[in-house]
């Protein structure tokens, strides 16, 4: 049970987390004016990764795309490819711990089989989620680098009692949501990859079935266990129970001292 | 189509306060701007300050201790409260839609608002 | 506060000639996230409210003939009447519309001579 728990979680996080890095990757404030020098400005300006914005107090927003890719900077770009990847490892990884969920049953999938492809997805959310949390990491040192530089030259042309303010950008709701949804993903992706070791099937060096003494009145049935080919593919034995309120995830995997018959 | 239309006492005693109030029509209060511009006989004109859609204001410096402007959006109107007036208060009082490039693109008629004793 | 600066404070020009009225602000009035320049003119006639004639230092509001024309950038912009006309005959206002309070200049007055 702990195992479904926890894989189904790591699936909904990642979910979440994804779903937050595509947000982050399409909005427009990645960076925003800063109003710090200004507060009373009637004209709003700010970024995302493929279009600038400007808002008038009237009311009236206009954006304009990035319609060059050559003239661009190469750490937008960077940003641009960072995110991008992040989304498509993301994706693929959803779509992959979608058929590795516990609780969907596909076929005569194993759970070998099933175990493989939740590492798989974790490793894969994990990736994505780092990328994402590159990507906004590399933006935010961008915008803190060029808002010191506007700031040690803040007032360009001083001639005479003419002054032009330079416009300063500072980070924008975007940075935090991929920021956060970066973090969902990457312990999405770990919970994934937690789950997983719980759904391996365990390899043991003997063949020798055993069985839980446990303080309960348990009757152990020979027939319980379900025939196993050897220590390859599905070595994890199931066992039955009279008293059986315990599923098959909640069945402890560390030996102990009345582990052996 | 749009409009705007001043209305209030013409006339205004010293240290009181002159309320005004623009009555638009053809457009949203809640997605347009008005703003507040007065000229004193024989000059030039003075923005006092706006109210913007969604309910944010901006006045002038020079009047931020006396003037407030609010309104009320199902009645479709804006209004205006100078506190403490003196005759240099005395002008034509304009209401105005903001528009693109926060110019000012509709204007009422005016009104003259007269402060003596 | 930006103060707005304008000249001449009266213009007389022959009717069918170019009348030029400049404004200068104390303060850049060029936007950098889309690099228009929020500066406003109006025509304001004796008895009348202001009308609207251009904003974006450059862009005609619609309805307002094409012999006049606004241009400059910055902190320097230029309002241009390519002929001039009976009808206009009336002070013109230019407006700073980037930093509040959005200010106006002291306004030129145009006379036919």
């Known amino acids: 049970m702990a195992v479904t728990a926890c894989q189904g979680l790591g699936f909904v996080v990642s979910l979440i987390g994804i779903a937050g890095i595509i947000a982050a990757t399409c909005m427009d404030q990645w960076s925003t004016q800063d109003l710090y020098n200004n507060p009373v400005t009637a004209v709003f300006n700010y970024q995302g990764l493929w279009r600038s914005c400007v808002r008038e107090s009237s009311g009236f927003t206009e954006c304009r795309g990035y319609f060059t890719l050559l003239g661009l900077p190469a750490m937008l770009q960077a940003v641009r490819a960072l995110m991008i990847v992040g989304i498509v490892l993301g994706a693929i990884g959803l779509l992959v711990s979608i058929f590795a969920l516990k609780c969907i049953r596909i076929g005569s999938m194993e759970d070998s089989a099933k175990a493989n492809m939740t590492l798989t997805s974790g490793i894969m959310f994990i990736v994505s989620g780092l990328c994402a949390i590159a990507g906004v990491s590399v933006f935010a040192n961008m915008l803190v680098t060029n808002f010191w530089m506007s700031t040690a030259n803040m007032y360009t042309g001083m001639g005479g009692m003419v002054q032009t303010v330079q416009t300063r950008y500072t980070f924008g709701a975007a940075l935090f949501v991929g920021w956060v949804a970066g973090g969902l993903t990457l312990i999405g992706g770990v919970m994934m990859c937690i789950a997983c070791r719980g759904l391996a099937p365990e390899e043991t060096n003997y063949k020798a079935v055993s069985y839980h003494a446990s303080g309960h009145s348990v009757a152990y049935k020979p027939g319980g266990f379900k025939a196993s080919t050897g220590f390859g593919s599905n070595t994890k034995n199931k066992k039955i129970y009279d008293g059986g309120a315990r599923t098959e995830d909640e069945v402890q995997s560390y030996p102990s001292k009345h582990d052996y018959v | 189509q749009v409009q705007l239309q001043e209305s209030g006492p013409g006339l205004v005693k010293p240290s009181e306060t002159l309320s005004l109030t623009c009555t638009v029509s053809?457009?949203?209060?809640?997605?347009?701007?008005v703003s507040w511009v007065r000229q004193p006989p024989g000059k030039g004109l003075e923005w006092l300050g706006v109210?913007?859609?969604?309910?944010?204001?901006n006045y002038h410096s020079t009047l931020i201790s006396r003037l407030t402007i609010s309104k009320d959006t199902s009645k479709s109107q804006v209004f205006l409260k100078l506190s403490s007036v003196t005759a240099a208060d005395t002008a034509v009082y304009y209401c105005a839609k903001a528009g693109r490039g926060n110019a000012l693109d509709y204007w009422g008629q005016g009104t003259l608002v007269t402060v003596s004793s | 506060d930006i103060v707005m600066t304008q000249s001449p404070d009266s213009l007389a020009v022959s009717l069918g000639e170019r009348a030029t009225i400049n404004c200068k602000s104390s303060q850049s009035l060029l936007n950098s996230g889309n690099q228009k320049n929020y500066l406003t003119w109006y025509q304001q006639k004796p008895g009348q409210p202001p009308k609207l004639l251009i904003y974006?230092?450059?862009t005609r509001e619609s309805g307002v003939p094409d012999r006049f024309s606004g241009s400059g950038s910055g902190t320097d912009f230029t309002l241009t009447i390519s002929s001039l006309q009976a009808e206009d005959v009336a002070v013109y206002y230019c407006q700073n519309d980037y930093s509040f309070p959005l200010t106006f200049g002291g306004g030129t007055k145009l006379e036919i001579k």
């Open positions: 053809g457009f949203s209060l809640t997605s347009y701007g």
């Open positions: 109210i913007w859609g969604d309910g944010s204001t």
């Open positions: 974006w230092a450059s």
